[in-house]
């Protein structure tokens, strides 16, 4: 397992929510991406392929997510101070071989300005 801090902007704030960006290499064809908050699995998305270049997406722990050819974005809404924590992207690469797990993450700081519906 390879661990490290994300070397890109992992958290993008908008409208009282946050988009958590989990990147993977372009060459990866089949994978599982899990979003961990501390040690807890918040979200998970698996992309597999089949005959005729069919792609299948599976979400066991469903979060609003968005898949591109080199990243999975998970969206958390209605931010409050309890969301402040370490978040990790846990990537399991099935294809191409060899099987590999990488863990990258960072700390989500919550500032007043990022909270939804503040009282003025």
């Amino acid at each position: 397992e390879i661990n490290g801090s994300a070397n890109y902007e992992m958290f993008i704030f908008h409208n009282g929510g946050v988009q958590i960006l989990c990147k993977y290499p372009d060459i990866v064809q089949q994978f599982k991406m899990q979003l961990l908050k501390g040690g807890q699995i918040l979200c998970d998305l698996t992309k597999t392929k089949g005959s005729g270049n069919t792609v299948s997406i599976k979400s066991l722990k469903f979060c609003h997510s968005q898949l591109s050819n080199n990243s999975v974005s998970f969206f958390l809404y209605n931010l409050d101070h309890s969301h402040a924590n370490y978040y990790f992207c846990n990537l399991s690469i099935f294809d191409p071989p060899p099987f590999k797990v990488t863990l990258t993450g960072g700390y989500l700081h919550i500032y007043e300005s990022q909270l939804c519906c503040q009282l003025k």
Epitope: T48, G50, S51, S56, K58, P97, F99
Partner: antibody, heavy 124, light 108 residues
Framework: EVQLVESGGGVIRPGGSLRLSCAAS????????MSWVRQAPGKGLEWVSG????????DYADSVKGRFTISRDNAKNSLYLQMNSLRAEDTALYYC????FGSGSYYNVPFDYWGQGTLVTVSS | EIVLTQSPGTLSLSPGERATLSCRAS???????LAWYQQKPGQAPRLLIY???SRATGIPDRFSGSGSGTDFTLTISRLEPEDFAVYYC?????????FGPGTKVDIK
């Protein structure tokens, strides 16, 4: 403990039909792609068919295409192979096999756990 | 379809010796989607190597795989009594997925 137990084999006349089953236990069945692999008596291994975790993508060897249908019932932790228009050359021990990674795919993944097989004999 | 050819058909060796098994593909096996299995009489196959060179869980390090493209090798560095069996290579990169005819490693 992971277990795959095949059943449904037997002696059948050419042109007949059989339905093989594979009962899975000891793991989360719908995390895995599954395949059927067969072995004729005294011969090597031949991949027959594969299916992904949810059953919406399947694939077949040319030798069985149009005659065999793979399916699964995740609620019952079971894999199936419907075999129609059977021929003498389909005589073999039929194994069900699980994808190694738990990727949910049968495609571009090797097989780790295999059952002990069920014997199909096609003879007149 | 990709045809896999294994050589030799039979390898007669003594315990403690080194075994080198070859698998040749009729066309390039993409991204090294090549596996090796061991099968003993009356048993189901057992995954040894995947991705041409990665050992499966629980496989002793005397088993190693190498190669890419069309030529692949399984090496058993020191044969143990339990290693005498039939070994199959398997390509899972192109459908239909295919197996080689097998190499039997028997006791000299």
């Amino acid at each position: 403990e992971v277990q795959l137990v095949e059943s449904g084999g037997g002696v059948i006349r050419p042109g007949g039909s059989l339905r093989l089953s594979c009962a899975a236990s000891g793991f989360t069945f719908d995390d895995y792609g599954m395949s059927w692999v067969r072995q004729a008596p005294g011969k090597g291994l031949e991949w027959v068919s594969g299916i992904n975790w949810i059953g919406d993508n399947t694939d077949y060897a040319d030798s069985v295409k149009g005659r065999f249908t793979i399916s699964r019932d995740n609620a019952k932790n079971s894999l199936y192979l419907q075999m129609n228009s059977l021929r003498a050359e389909d005589t073999a021990l039929y194994y069900c096999a699980r994808d190694y990674f738990g990727s949910g795919s049968y495609y571009n993944v090797p097989f780790d756990y295999w059952g002990q097989g069920t014997l199909v004999t096609v003879s007149s | 379809e990709i045809v896999l050819t294994q050589s030799p058909g039979t390898l007669s060796l003594s315990p403690g010796e080194r075994a080198t098994l070859s698998c040749r593909a009729s066309q390039s096996v993409s991204s090294s989607y090549l596996a090796w299995y061991q099968q003993k009489p009356g048993q189901a196959p057992r995954l040894l190597i995947y991705g041409a060179s990665s050992r499966a869980t629980g496989i002793p390090d005397r088993f190693s795989g190498s190669g890419s493209g069309t030529d692949f090798t399984l090496t058993i560095s020191r044969l143990e009594p339990e290693d005498f069996a039939v070994y199959y290579c398997h390509q899972y990169g192109n459908s239909p997925f295919t197996f080689g005819p097998g190499t039997k490693v028997d006791i000299k």
